[in-house]
Every structure is written in C-alpha cells, then in structure tokens.
C-alpha cells in the first residue's frame, strides 16, 4: 500500500536486523514523469539494489559489525539517465542481534592491593570487548566474580563493579586481608553480555592473580611527653609512613587550638615544637594526613595521641587569703571546727598534688599554745585541749603550712569564738493560712513571706536561720530564700505548679541554725510552721516529652517506612491528635493517634539533611489547645547520584590547525556525601569510536585530563563523551559530554566573523 512500503522519492530511514535472510522488499519508490528509472548509489556493498521501477531491496543478510549504517542515495532519472529528482539520502540502520560473544582482552590479569585499602577503591580493571552494539543489551557487559581462592569463612574479600570491571576490596577485605596470613589470592571473573540478565547471553572468563602487600600507613602507639621539657625543640616524638615515596604529609588539628605545638616533615616524622604544659592541656589528639601531588588524600587520616606527663611544677594554693571558721564557747574536745581545703594544679591522685597540712603558729597563745590541731591529710581543724571562752579570747589566728612533695605554702585561718547556740528559732506564726494560686503562676514569683527570730548572738551561725520545707512538696516546686540581715524567708516558685498532680499541698516549714544546738536543747514546735497551697486549674496545652525529636534513616528507605515517632500528653488528660507542619517537601505523614511518622515519598539526602518539620499536638475536645515540637530526620547517604561535570565546560577550544597534541583538564563532582577523603572517580571515554582521536587520563579523584591523540582534526566542534564512575556502593556512572571546538585563532582567541557571534568559545588550550 502507499505509505509504509511505497511512495514518492524522499529522504527515508529503514531499520533492518542483521543476520536475517531477505524476506521482503524495503520500499517501492514511485516515479513522477519525466522520471522513468531510479539509481542507487552510496554504501551499497553489493547488498542493496534498486530495480529500474524503484523497488529497493537487499539480496543477502546484513552484518552490523561490518557496517552499522548504510548511507545510500536514490535518484530518479529520466529516459536519458539524467537526474530529475534527488538524489535523496536513504539510511539503512542495521539493528543488532547478539551474534558476538564478549572476550576478555587478557586471559590472565595480575595485580596487587595493600591491606586495609579503602573498600570500593579500584586497584585493578579487567576489560572485555563485545562487537555487538553497546547501546543494546547485546553489547552491555556484566562482570562477576565466579570464585575467590582461597575463600576464608565464606567471606568475599574482593568485589567487582559489574559495569566497569573495576576490582576493589569489600569492607571485610579491607579489614581482614593480611599478607602475613595469606599473601596471594586468585579470582575467576566472568563477563556476560545481555547485561547478565538472559540465559541466552554469551560469556567468557579470565583469571586474576592478586598479591596482598603490607600497609604501613598505620597509627603509631600513643606518645607520652613530659611537660616543661628543657631539651632543644623541635623534638621528634613519633612517625608515620605512606606506602610509597612522594607523599605529602600534613597534620590536622581537629580541636582548632589557638596554639598547636606539633609539626610533621616530608619524611613523615612528627615533632613537638615547644614545651608543653599539662595544666594547660593534658592530652592532644590530632590527625596525620598523606596526600598526593595534587593535594588529594591518599587514604584515611591517622589518629595521633599525645599524653602530657605531669611534673610537680605547681605549689599548693589556699582557698582564700583568710579562711574564717566559728566555734561555740562550750564545744567539746575533738569537735570539728571546719576543713581547710587547699588546691594543687598538678595531676590529681599523684604525689605531685598530694597535700599535707601542719599548724605552724597560733596567735594568741592564750590560755595556751596548741589549742587546735589539723588532720595531716584531710585538713580538718579540731578543738584539741579545752573549751574556749569568748570573753577571754574572742578570736584566734592560725598559720597553716600546706605542702606537696616539693613545695610549701602558708595559709591563714581565723577562728571566731561565738556565743553558745542555746536558743532555737521561733516562728512568729505557726500557720500562714491558705494561699490560692493559678497553676500557670510564673516561676520565680514570691508567694509568701515567713519570719522566725533567734535570740542567740546576732550575725553568727547560732542566730542565722535557714528555712526548709520538710513536708508537702516532694516535687520541689517551692523554695525559701533567707535575707541574712533580717532572717526573713521568702517562699518562691521554683518549678511550675500543677493542678493535675497537686491541687492542694499542706506545706510544713522548719527553721534551724547552721551551728549545732548545745547539748540538751532541741528544736520544738515553735520552729515549725505550716500553710496550705491551693492550686487552681488552667486549661494547658499538651506537653511533648522532648523539645526536639530526632530520627535517623537511610535516604533510600521504602515508601511507607516508619521513620520516627513523637509523644505528647495533655495535662488535663484529654486525647491528643498529632499533625505535621512545614513538611515542605511532602515526604512525611503522621499517624494522628499514635504519633508515628512514616515516609510517603522518596527521600533525598542531597535535597537537605537533616529534614526539619514541626509536629503539632492538639487536644481533642476542650479548647483544642496545641503545642509544637521539632522533628529532625537525619538522612544517611546512599550512593544515588551519578557523577557529573563540576561546572559548565562550553567554550573549550583548540586553535586550528593543531601544531602538537593538546590537552585540557576537567573536574567531576556528584551530590552524594563524601567524608574525609572526598570522591574517587574513575574516567574513561564514553564510546570506543572516540579512542582514535582522544585519550582520557585520571589526575586524581575528581580531575582528569582529556588529550588529543593526533593533530589532524577538522575545523569544527567535536562532542567528546566521557564516562565517569564513582566507585560507590552500588557504583554509579554518568556519561557527560565535553564540547571541544577546533577553530581559527586570532591572538589566541577563537575567530568568528561578524554575524557569527553566538556561542564563541572562551577557553583556549
């Protein structure tokens, strides 16, 4: 019929599977007078024929690997053979069938890997080729490890990137490979076409011998360095070594100290650059990093620990210029007067900070010397010989020597003799009545003033009054502050009042002295007072159990996964309904009843982590009060972003004609998380057909160099496809295009005649 298999002469494209014997015509072209015949030219390969009436057919099976596209031309001729229409392009695209098996470039590969190498970092590539079309499954290769010998505890130490053939260590391999235990391994690798997905795929195998070499990039033992060293600095304290020469070493101070007293040289020797002071800092943790010539880390950093050893370089210090204690007139022998606590900045629980106390002088020596003693190690002062009389000597001064093993310090103690504490505090009221407060009364509010008096010597520990709530406030919602001049007590709210748990509280106060009462005198009912606190209800909003709820999930969790939950309670006991606010990305939903939070869409760490939303708890019924808390969802990275170019590379050019092969450098990036080391991309040309003209070589984990292989380029734009693999788990690959223009140059810039100014390349190579 007209249309599908016949029609006028016009440009057309036909797709035909290779390897099939001809079964039907390709097309019947119709002639318009004066055309009477048709002529076929181009890449016919004696396979394609056109009959004089315009019947286009092929006479034997095609082979895509010989020619993937036949570019033909058909012209309509008049009776004299003169072209009257056309010629028009007729394109025959030969569709691939899987008629070629993949073949490894080598039957045996050899490589070496260091123990503790980073998992996933390729150390060897196997490479197979398949003549079939790489854009179809027929030419898509899938690499697999068939067997690892030896296999210890059924654990694979090696892995292969199914697409690129890059062999690397697994996490277990990184941790367990040890050349002392097993210096060599053999892998049998298979490659299948059809992406490995079909039972009809072809395959090939190769053998890989791997030598495990020792990794000397190891953290040294912790170093001990004596403080205040007088030796000439810098002093070598330890060393690190990269596995190969030429590494550039540096130290990283994670603590960001104002003074970082360490350095490293290019041999990897680590030095302390100045004397250390343990009392300033007793330990240092920092990192040694080895980088390549481009400044990219070669491996993980090593943790260096330096402990600063103490010397006795600090004398004891007194707690204050004069320490004041009080003693009652009638106190008995052996009673504790108080404890002198001196300090020493040297290391605790060592001889350098172990202190001795000794009384070296007492003034006045009335009625005799030696009235006091001090416990040698505890510093506690006691009455040694007799009770004291205030009217004889109201005050004593002691000089106490405090010493460590090298230093002595004198401290001064003043002991005031005070009247005996034979009077108890007496409340002016025994019952302060009822006090009604709303439960939302502010914290810090003074709600009651209480007063007791004591007839003992004013402004001494015998007459000073301390108020305690001894009953009715087990939650500690109230407190009492005392005015030292008037002994007035101010009852204040320390914690929120709560109608729901304590509507009525019967509070009991006790008034007592800091000095003990004399023998035979006891506190009685006069030293106690009460009052009743009535708390009235205020309808309160629900209360979350936390201000911020936090959860952590992998960014690739399935939709519907529970990612966290929140809890709130209503003080009045009402039911609570939960909702979300600020879920701008529409990732989450919350169960209104339970507070469980679920994912409802794919999560993406690269869009932002943590993802912060607000959770709202609302009373069901009542006055529908609500409160808000934060929910922070920390998204853990998975390798879900293929590499891409780090910036726009339009405008790259070479001046035409090339006088010598040239090169340019480009940078790749991806949006996944890269910890200390940064990304480690591998680069290759995007298609085999580019290999005659171009070459790509890796510079470091993020940069590569694209070089021309010759100088015979046309004056036009070339689009170079580059394959970038991130070596992640799973490995992802991006194919990027670098447009490179070869153009005539004027003063090193691309020359474009007037009127051709769009898209002028701006970067010359």
């Amino acid at each position: 019929q007209e249309g599908k298999f016949s029609g006028p002469l016009k440009p057309m494209t036909f797709s035909i599977y290779e390897g099939q014997e001809p079964s039907q015509i390709i097309f019947q072209f119709k002639a318009n007078p004066p055309a009477v015949t048709f002529e076929l030219t181009g890449e016919t390969d004696n396979i394609f024929v056109i009959e004089r009436e315009g019947l286009l057919y092929y006479n034997r099976a095609l082979d895509r690997e010989t020619r993937s596209t036949h570019n033909l031309q058909v012209a309509a001729l008049d009776a004299n053979g003169i072209i009257v229409e056309g010629p028009v392009p007729i394109t025959i695209k030969v569709k691939d069938i899987n008629d070629n098996r993949p073949t490894f470039l080598q039957s045996k590969y050899e490589g070496s890997v260091r123990q503790n190498s980073r998992p996933g970092k390729p150390f060897l590539y196997v490479n197979a080729t398949d003549l079939d079309d790489p854009a179809t499954p027929n030419g898509q290769l899938y690499y697999q490890i068939v067997i690892q010998l030896p296999m210890i505890n059924n654990v694979m130490y090696f892995q292969i990137n199914n697409k690129t053939g890059a062999i690397s260590l697994t996490r277990e391999g990184s941790q367990e490979l040890n050349p002392a235990k097993n210096p060599s391994y053999n892998l049998v690798i298979s490659v299948k076409d059809m992406g490995g997905q079909s039972e009809n795929s072809f395959s090939d195998t190769t053998s890989v011998d791997i030598i495990v070499t020792e990794n000397i990039w190891k953290a040294p033992k912790p170093v001990e360095m004596v403080e205040n060293s007088t030796d000439p600095h810098p002093i070598k304290i330890t060393q690190v070594r990269w596995n190969d020469p030429g590494a550039q070493y540096s130290l990283v101070d994670k603590e960001k100290l104002p003074r970082f007293p360490f350095s490293i040289d290019q041999e990897g020797d680590i030095y302390v650059t100045q004397p250390l002071d343990r009392e300033e800092k007793d330990a240092y943790v920092f990192y040694a990093v080895a980088k390549d010539e481009y400044g990219k880390p070669l491996s993980y950093p090593l943790e260096i620990h330096v402990k600063v050893k103490d010397i006795n370089d600090n004398p004891p210090t007194c707690p204050s210029p004069v320490t004041v204690f009080e003693v009652q007139e009638n106190e008995r022998l052996g009673n504790s007067i108080g404890t002198l606590t001196a300090h020493d900045r040297d290391e605790e629980n060592t001889a350098n900070s172990f202190l001795n106390y000794r009384i070296v002088e007492q003034t006045p020596k009335l009625p005799m010397d030696g009235l006091f003693l001090i416990q040698t190690y505890a510093g506690m002062l006691q009455l040694a010989k007799q009770s004291l009389k205030k009217q004889d000597t109201p005050q004593y001064n002691l000089t106490i020597e405090v010493s460590d093993k090298d230093f002595k310090t004198l401290c001064f103690v003043q002991i005031n003799v005070i009247d005996i504490n034979d009077q108890i505090p007496i409340f002016e009221k025994s019952d302060y009545g009822n006090l009604t407060l709303a439960e939302d009364t502010n914290i810090g509010s003074t709600i009651l003033t209480i007063q007791a008096t004591d007839a003992d010597e004013p402004f001494t520990g015998s007459s000073k009054i301390l108020y305690h709530i001894i009953k009715g406030d087990s939650e500690g919602r109230l407190g009492v502050d005392t005015d030292p001049h008037t002994n007035t007590g101010y009852v204040i709210i320390k914690k929120p009042l709560d109608f729901e748990t304590a509507a009525v509280s019967n509070i009991v106060f006790k008034a007592e002295n800091p000095e003990p009462l004399v023998f035979g005198v006891k506190y009685n009912a006069s030293s106690f007072a009460k009052f009743t606190l009535i708390v009235t209800d205020v309808n309160e909003a629900p209360q979350f159990s936390q201000h911020v709820f936090q959860a952590k999930v992998s960014e690739d969790v399935a939709i519907g996964t529970k990612v966290g939950n929140v809890t709130a309670k209503d003080p009045e006991g009402l039911d609570i309904s939960y909702s979300l606010r600020g879920d701008t990305r529409g990732w989450l939903k919350i169960d209104h009843v339970t507070g469980e939070i679920f994912s409802v869409a794919p999560l993406d760490r690269e869009a932002g982590s943590p993802y912060r939303v607000q959770v709202v708890a609302t009373e069901v019924g009542g006055s529908s009060l609500s409160s808000v808390s934060e929910f922070h969802l920390i998204l853990m990275d998975v390798n879900d972003n293929p590499p891409r170019l780090a910036k726009d590379y339009t405008g790259l050019f070479f001046c035409h004609p090339l006088s010598a092969p040239g090169s340019l450098i480009f940078e790749a990036t991806d949006d996944d998380q890269h910890l200390f080391r940064g990304p480690h991309f591998t680069f290759s040309l995007g298609s085999g057909s580019l290999q005659n003209d171009w070459e790509v070589s890796k510079i470091n984990g993020t940069h590569a160099r694209l070089s021309t292989r010759h100088t015979e380029f046309e004056e036009r734009e070339y689009v170079v496809l580059i394959r970038i693999n991130d070596g992640g788990r799973p490995p992802l690959e991006g194919i990027v295009s670098l447009p490179v223009t070869f153009c005539s140059c004027v003063e090193g810039s691309c020359f474009r005649p007037a009127g051709h100014q769009t898209g002028i390349p701006t970067v010359g190579m």
């Epitope: 007078p33 004066p34 009477v36 015949t37 030219t41 004089r52 031309q73 012209a75 008049d78 009776a79 004299n80 053979g81 003169i82 072209i83 056309g86 010629p87």
Partner: antibody
C-alpha cells in the same frame, strides 16, 4: 549491428509539412531514447528533442515547440519527426541519433547517428 | 538555456602538432550529487554524421585514439589533440547534457596545413 536509417531528402513548399523517418535495427527499440538534431549548411548542431518509445515520453526544445512533433512506431521500430508550417529557415539537414544510456549502462553520449535527411523549403 | 561557446572557430595546424580547443558554458555543468561534468565532445568529418570522442568531460570513448584528451570542470573545458593526424580534419563540437534543452557549441573547424 546497430543502424539508424533515415528517409530520403525532401523538397517542400512553404506552409506545408514534412515527416522524416528514422528506422532502427540491431537493438531493442524501446530501450533507448531517439534524439533529433538540426544542422543548417555550414552551421552547428541544434538539439530539437527526444522521444522514449517505451513510455512514449517526449521532450522538446522550447524553440521547436509547435514546429516539431515526435512520434514512434514500436511495431516497425521507427521514429518520426514531423515539421509543420514550413518556412525557408527550416531548410537544413535533420539528424536522428540514439542516446547511449539505458538502465544499467553508463553511456552518456550519442553513440549512433542516422545519415541525415535534407529538407529543402522553397517556393 | 545553457549557452556553449567554442573557440577558436577554426584553426589550421600541421600534422604532428598539438591542438587545444576551448569550450565554455554559461553555467556550471558539474553535478553536485556525483561530481561529474555533463559534457561530451564530438567529431564531425566532412559529409558524415558526428561521432563521440569524450563524455563526462574527460572519459575517452572506447576505440578513440589516446591522442584525444578532454579536461576541465565547471564552466571551462578543453579538448586536446596531442599529435594531429591528417584524418583529424573535422569540425569538433562540445555538447552539454546537464539540463534541457541540450545545447551544442558552434564548433571548431580543424584544418590541416
């Protein structure tokens, strides 16, 4: 062998018509186009047009349209050129020639010619 | 119509001499699709019908002596006879078959001294 034999000389009065024949032999008549040329004494050649006997396709030089009619008789393998409304400037030798091209060949030239027919127009 | 101009209109040479004659077209005869020049050269001896010498501007017809050579492209063409013989006495025509109407040059008459 291929031959093109034209009819004999003609003397005609102005205003009359003449039909010159070109009988071919030695090949399949319908495979090739037959062309006609005019050559006046001491002058160059002028292309009049052609006929393709297979499909009876004709093409004329615009200059000779209305003056010349080309026909062919497949049964006798003969091509004809008729000149009408003769005038003195039609006096010339008229040549038929076979164009060498046919489907599958690459002979882009006149490979065989008739001996020529002289037409004289005179009162 | 494409106008074909031949020069010289006549020339006389001695046997053994080299002859070149020119043919110019008013537009290019080079076809872009096959890069061929649609031009032929014919020889017409006195009292005879024309006979082809050259087609596609430079392809010699079989049986034509190799002293006849066609050259040129586009609009300028040349027929060269390297060593003239007495039987080469004739009128030489160029003809274009690039577009209808096909046209001939006015001819170059070759005389033998």
């Amino acid at each position: 062998q291929v031959q093109l034999v034209q009819s004999g000389a003609e003397v005609k009065k102005p205003g009359s018509s003449v039909k010159v024949s070109c009988k071919v032999s030695g090949y399949t008549f319908t495979d090739h186009t037959i062309h006609w040329m005019k050559q006046r004494p001491g002058q160059g050649l002028e292309w009049i047009g052609y006929i393709y006997p297979r499909d009876v396709i004709t093409q004329y030089n615009e200059k000779f349209k209305g003056k010349v009619t080309l026909t062919a008789d497949k049964s006798t393998s003969t091509a004809y050129m008729e000149l009408s409304s003769l005038r003195s400037e039609d006096t010339a030798v008229y040549l038929c020639a076979r164009w060498g091209y046919f489907y599958g060949s690459r002979s882009y030239y006149f490979d065989y010619w008739g001996q020529g027919t002289t037409v004289t127009v005179s009162s | 119509d494409i106008v074909m101009s031949q020069s010289p209109s006549s020339l006389a040479v001695s046997v053994g001499e080299k002859v070149t004659m020119s043919c110019k077209s008013s537009q290019s005869l080079l076809h872009s699709s096959n890069q061929k020049n649609y031009l032929a050269w014919y020889q017409q001896k006195p009292g005879q019908s024309p006979k082809v010498l050259i087609y596609w501007a430079s392809t010699r017809e079989s049986g034509v002596p190799d002293r006849f050579t066609g050259s040129g492209s586009g609009t300028d063409f040349t027929l060269t006879i390297t060593s003239v013989k007495s039987e080469d006495l004739a009128v030489y025509y160029c003809q274009q078959y690039y577009s209808y109407p096909w046209t001939f040059g006015g001819g170059t008459r070759l005389e033998i001294k």
